[in-house]
Interface confidence: low
């Protein structure tokens, strides 16, 4: 037989299929010009010493072969003895290691079999009603195709699917979208309506992220509040990497996940802007306020589920930084100003109540007064901090109040509202004999003692009703008892107690009269 012809004799090897897993596969045959044809195939397994034979059976039942040697591609003309206008059945037999391996058969009409290309160029991927939609431009002069896809995940083998017939300048396919796992897709095409026509090669991989972007494994921590009233937010661990299918490893456009940081400043709700979104790599400085921090994972299908962390407020207090003066017209606060043209946010809430009950006031931008102080005043009618209870006050400052990450904490402290001097008056003052010339004075703690740092001291006053002599005794704010000594028997005394703050003298308690009885000897 001539090499250019299909040889109508028995092939030079025994006719037995070894049934091994390796061997020839993916046979494709098509017309490549007006009178020339090509068949190509893949061979899986060791290629050393393998000889390939392209087998062909005509509709008459006669069969022939082309010897291809070690090549996996063979061309022949319409004069090679193979009928090109009628249906033929083709397959490949590979003779290797004393055994024959056979490919699956293809049955087709060679003249009408055109070499189809897989989708070329960009494949647009989008989400449609919970499914994946792929769209591409039909290769030139190839309108009218059947399209198949195959897909796999990092953990599963290829699965085959059908896109159905296509008959337009653009072709598309609906495919399954995985919720939590990346997928690799490949597409192939063949001529529509041509019985037995060969499939194209598979397209380049299309890498598709999961519908839900992977959540990063991150832990946040905040540093101590610095002298400037700011603290750094730091990230403890990098985002988790998405596992990719084999063909998507390395560079896998389409599976990228971007992580963004969303800050929500919970304190000072009267400011203009409460949230800000940043890139995850850029760790911001925060004030001492309370924040919610969310990490938003996004891929080409949009954002996924948020992970949210709460960063509690820094509760370190400055007991002396805030001066409060109470007058007939109202109350004024003074504190060391930060800089020129600063906006301040003053926030207060009753101690022991939920943070949701915080009230705040935003000042207009202000410069320091001649003493370098910033101020905030309010009238009694406004009702601000008007109740006689302990308030926690925080003052924040910013030169750019519209920028969430530029706020700083000026100070945090406690303040007793309303008429503190009267409300703080100690009650239940009692006098007990202690010795022949001394007594013990006890009282119930002042309401001011519930407010950390507010009560500066107690003062106990003792008045000799005979001589009108008065003595005053300062007592630590943590004590509620004092011993008065050097008293004379038979003299009437009155005792009173008051509670003082750093800026306010308290109101004396009701006078308590007592005297030490004269001891009469038997």
């Amino acid at each position: 037989c001539r090499t250019s012809e299909c040889c109508f004799q028995d092939p030079p090897y025994p006719d037995a299929d070894s049934g091994s897993a390796s061997g020839p596969r993916d046979l494709r045959c098509y017309r490549i010009s007006s009178d020339r044809y090509e068949c190509s195939w893949q061979y899986e397994g060791p290629t050393a010493g393998v000889s390939h034979f392209l087998r062909c059976c005509l509709s008459s039942g006669r069969c022939c072969y082309f010897a291809a040697g070690s090549a996996t591609r063979l061309q022949f003309s319409d004069q090679a003895g193979v009928s090109v206008l009628y249906t033929v059945t083709l397959w490949v037999e590979s003779w290797a290691r004393n055994q024959t391996e056979k490919s699956p058969e293809v049955t087709l009409q060679l003249y009408n079999s055109v070499k189809y290309e897989p989708p070329l160029g960009d494949i647009k991927v989008s989400k449609l009603a919970g499914q994946l939609r792929m769209e591409w431009e039909t290769p030139d002069n190839q309108v009218g195709a059947e399209v198949q896809f195959r897909h796999r995940t990092p953990s599963s083998p290829w699965k085959l699917g059908d896109c159905g017939p296509q008959d337009d300048d653009t072709e598309s396919c609906l495919c399954p979208l995985e919720m939590n796992v990346a997928q690799e897709f490949q597409l192939r095409r063949r001529q529509l309506g041509s019985q037995g026509s060969s499939w194209s090669k598979w397209s380049s991989p299309v890498c598709v992220p999961p519908e839900n972007p992977p959540q990063p494994q991150v832990r946040f921590s905040v540093e101590q509040l610095g002298q400037d009233g700011r603290r750094r937010l730091t990230l403890k661990e990098q985002p988790t990497q998405l596992e990719l299918p084999e063909g998507c490893q390395g560079l896998a456009p389409g599976t990228e996940v971007t992580y963004r940081l969303q800050l929500h400043m919970l304190s000072c709700p009267c400011k203009a802007k409460a949230t800000r979104t940043l890139h995850l790599g850029k760790m911001p400085y925060l004030s001492g306020a309370a924040y919610n921090v969310a990490v938003i994972s996004s891929n080409q299908f949009g954002p996924g589920l948020n992970q949210t962390w709460h960063i509690p407020a820094d509760t370190h207090t400055e007991p002396v930084a805030l001066n409060i003066s109470v007058g007939t017209n109202g109350t004024t606060m003074y504190w060391p100003a930060r800089a020129q043209s600063m906006t301040y946010c003053i926030e207060w809430q009753p101690v022991g109540q939920d943070g949701g009950l915080a009230t705040c006031s935003l000042t207009a931008p202000q410069d320091p007064d001649p003493a370098g102080m910033a101020t905030y005043s309010w009238s009694r009618e406004s009702g601000a901090m008007g109740q006689e209870k302990c308030y926690y006050i925080t003052i924040f400052a910013s030169a750019h109040p519209e920028k969430l990450t530029l706020w700083s904490t000026v100070l945090s402290t406690y303040h007793f509202g309303g008429n503190a001097s009267a409300a703080g008056t100690p009650h239940h003052v009692s006098v007990k004999n202690h010795s022949l010339d001394s007594v013990s004075v006890d009282w119930a703690p002042s309401l001011l003692s519930t407010c950390p740092g507010v009560l500066k001291e107690y003062v106990v006053r003792c008045r000799d009703e005979d001589s009108k002599q008065v003595s005053e005794h300062p007592v630590q704010p943590t004590e509620t008892q004092v011993t008065l000594s050097g008293l004379r028997a038979g003299v009437a005394y009155t005792v009173q107690v008051r509670a003082d703050t750093a800026w306010l003298r308290g109101v004396w308690s009701q006078p308590q009269r007592f005297s030490i009885e004269v001891q009469v000897s038997d």
Epitope: P154, S155, A182, P214, Q217, T240, L242
Partner: nanobody, 123 residues
Framework: QVQLVESGGGLVQPGGSLRLSCIAS????????MKWVRRPPGKGLEWVSV????????KYSDAVRGRFTISRDNAKNTLYLQMNSLKPEDTAVYYC????????????????RGQGTQVTVSS
Amino acid sequence: QVQLVESGGGLVQPGGSLRLSCIASGFTFSDYAMKWVRRPPGKGLEWVSVIDSEGPTIKYSDAVRGRFTISRDNAKNTLYLQMNSLKPEDTAVYYCAKSNGGSAFSSVLYTDRGQGTQVTVSS
């Protein structure tokens, strides 16, 4: 609290072998698939191998298939990675990681990983 402690790393010549161990605590080890991942110098994390909760389902990355063997001992709460025919490109910090579920393929992510053990392959 989940804790994963790797050991067994070190310096080895090309062609040599090492056996990494990972002792797990703070969770029911036998309920979770376990993975080895690695970070070569100057690169991102690479997935190496995974074994499901019961052990029969095992998968390896192409880079290590045929040379590395993953195994686990649920009674000892320990994960192993036997590394043979080591190459310079296997140089990395190796981390043991806990999967999100029991199946080796129930999740593409791991939830926790250890501090890592350094493997250096050099002549």
